[in-house]
C-alpha cells in the first residue's frame, strides 16, 4: 500500500540535492584556499541533520546551528554587499569587485543558492515532490529558516559602510517584506555600522528620474535613521556601464555619472 504523503504548495526538493550540495562544497573549498580544511561530508551531514526526519513546518534556527559552526568563515565586515530583488547584478558586481561579499559569496550562501529542500516527519526521506510554501503553508520551513538564519547573522557581522543594491524597476524599490527589509535591515548593529548606502539600479535606458526620492526609499531612510545609522542613496542609471567601470575604472568615460 503506498504511504500517504503530505502535499505542500511549493516545489519539491531540487533534484540531486545531496550531490549538488556536496559538489558545491568541494568546488567552493577548491576555489577558496582559506576554506580547504572544510570537511564537505561533515558539512552535508550537518545540512541534512537540520531538516531530515523533522516536520517541514517546524524547523528552527537551532536546527541549523551545527551547520553554522562548520561554515565559520572570515568576511571583512566593511566589505558587505546586501541586495534585494536584484541578485544577478549583485553577484556580477562581486565577481569583478573581488574584495566585496554578498551572502552567496560565502560557503553557506553558495551551498544553498537557488536550491529547495525539505524532509518529512519521522522518515529519513527527502521530499522531492513538494515542500512548504512560505505564504500558503508555513514560514518555519527548512529553506525560509535557513535564509533567515544566515541573513540575520550576515547583517549582524557588517560594519562601517554597508552597501545594498536595490531594483529600481520594481513597484516597491524597498520592500519591507523582502529578506533585506524584514531581516537584514533590523539586524545591522548601530554600534558597528556607520552608514547604509543604497544603490538603486535603473532598468530603462532613458530613465533619468531620481529614484532615491521614491517613497519606499524614504521609508527605508526613516527605518535606518531611527536605528541611529546614517543613510545615503545613489542612482545607478546605467548598470551595464556601472559594471564596465568597476572592471576598468581608469576608462575616461567612467568619470561621468553612471
Amino acid at each position: 500500500v503506498p504511504r500517504w504523503r503530505q502535499q505542500w504548495s511549493g516545489p519539491g526538493t531540487t533534484k540531486r540535492f545531496p550531490e549538488t550540495v556536496l559538489a558545491r562544497c568541494v568546488k567552493y573549498t577548491e576555489i577558496h584556499p582559506e576554506m580547504r580544511h572544510v570537511d564537505c561530508q561533515s558539512v552535508w551531514d550537518a545540512f541534512k541533520g537540520a531538516f531530515i526526519s523533522k516536520h517541514p513546518c517546524n524547523i528552527t534556527e537551532e536546527d541549523y546551528q551545527p551547520l553554522m559552526k562548520l561554515g565559520t568563515q572570515t568576511v571583512p565586515c566593511n566589505k558587505i554587499l546586501l541586495w534585494s530583488r536584484i541578485k544577478d547584478l549583485a553577484h556580477q558586481f562581486t565577481q569583478v569587485q573581488r574584495d566585496m561579499f554578498t551572502l552567496e559569496d560565502t560557503l553557506l550562501g553558495y551551498l544553498a543558492d537557488d536550491l529547495t529542500w525539505c524532509g518529512e516527519f519521522n522518515t529519513s526521506k527527502i521530499n522531492y515532490q513538494s515542500c512548504p510554501d512560505w505564504r500558503k503553508d508555513c514560514s518555519n520551513n527548512p529553506v525560509s529558516v535557513f535564509w533567515k538564519t544566515v541573513s540575520r547573522r550576515f547583517a549582524e557581522a557588517a560594519c562601517d559602510v554597508v552597501h545594498v543594491m536595490l531594483n529600481g524597476s520594481r513597484s516597491k524599490i524597498f520592500d519591507k517584506n523582502s529578506t533585506f527589509g524584514s531581516v537584514e535591515v533590523h539586524n545591522l548593529q548601530p554600534e558597528k555600522v556607520q552608514t547604509l548606502e543604497a544603490w538603486v539600479i535603473h532598468g530603462g535606458r532613458e530613465d533619468s528620474r531620481d529614484l532615491c526620492q521614491d517613497p519606499t526609499i524614504k521609508e527605508l531612510e526613516s527605518i535606518i535613521s531611527k536605528r541611529n545609522i546614517q543613510f545615503s542613496c545613489k542612482n545607478i542609471y546605467r548598470p551595464d556601464k556601472f559594471l564596465q567601470c568597476v572592471k576598468n575604472p581608469e576608462d575616461s568615460s567612467c568619470t561621468s555619472e553612471i
Epitope: 565559520t72 565586515c77 544566515v150
Partner: nanobody, 117 residues
Framework: EVQVLESGGGLVQPGGSLRLSCAAS????????MSWVRQAPGKGLEWVSA????????DYADSVKGRFTISRDNSKNTLYLQMNSLRVEDTAVYYC??????????RGQGTLVTVSS
C-alpha cells in the same frame, strides 16, 4: 569602532592549562554575544565557543566540549577562555570576535597557544 586585545597565550605541555583574556572596547560589550575562534598553522578558521551578552547562553565546538570554559565579566569588558587538558591539536592563534558567527572579521592580533612536549 569595535576593538579587542587578546592575551594569555603561551607554550604549554599536553594536559596543561591556560586562561585567555580578551579586553574589548568601542562598543557596549554587554549587549553583544562574543566568540572565540582559532586558526591552526596552515589551516582555516575554526569556531571554538560563544557566549551571549548576559552569559545566559553558551555553546562549544565538539572538539573542546568538556575541556574549555568560556566566560565574561561585563563590568570589565572582558571575555575569557579557560582551557584545560590541552592537546597538541589545540595549537593555534586564538582570536575573540563579536557575534556568534559563522561570519567573523576579527579585529585583534590574536594570541598564540602552542601545545607541545
Amino acid at each position: 569602532e569595535v576593538q579587542v586585545l587578546e592575551s594569555g597565550g603561551g607554550l604549554v605541555q599536553p594536559g596543561g592549562s591556560l586562561r585567555l583574556s580578551c579586553a574589548a572596547s568601542g562598543f557596549t560589550f554587554s549587549r553583544f554575544a562574543m566568540s572565540w575562534v582559532r586558526q591552526a598553522p596552515g589551516k582555516g578558521l575554526e569556531w571554538v565557543s560563544a557566549i551571549s551578552g548576559s552569559a545566559g547562553s553558551i555553546d562549544y565546538a565538539d572538539s573542546v566540549k568538556g575541556r574549555f570554559t568560556i566566560s565574561r565579566d561585563n563590568s570589565k569588558n572582558t571575555l575569557y577562555l579557560q582551557m584545560n587538558s590541552l592537546r597538541v591539536e589545540d595549537t593555534a592563534v586564538y582570536y575573540c570576535a563579536d557575534g556568534t558567527g559563522p561570519f567573523f572579521d576579527y579585529r585583534g592580533q590574536g594570541t598564540l597557544v602552542t601545545v607541545s612536549s
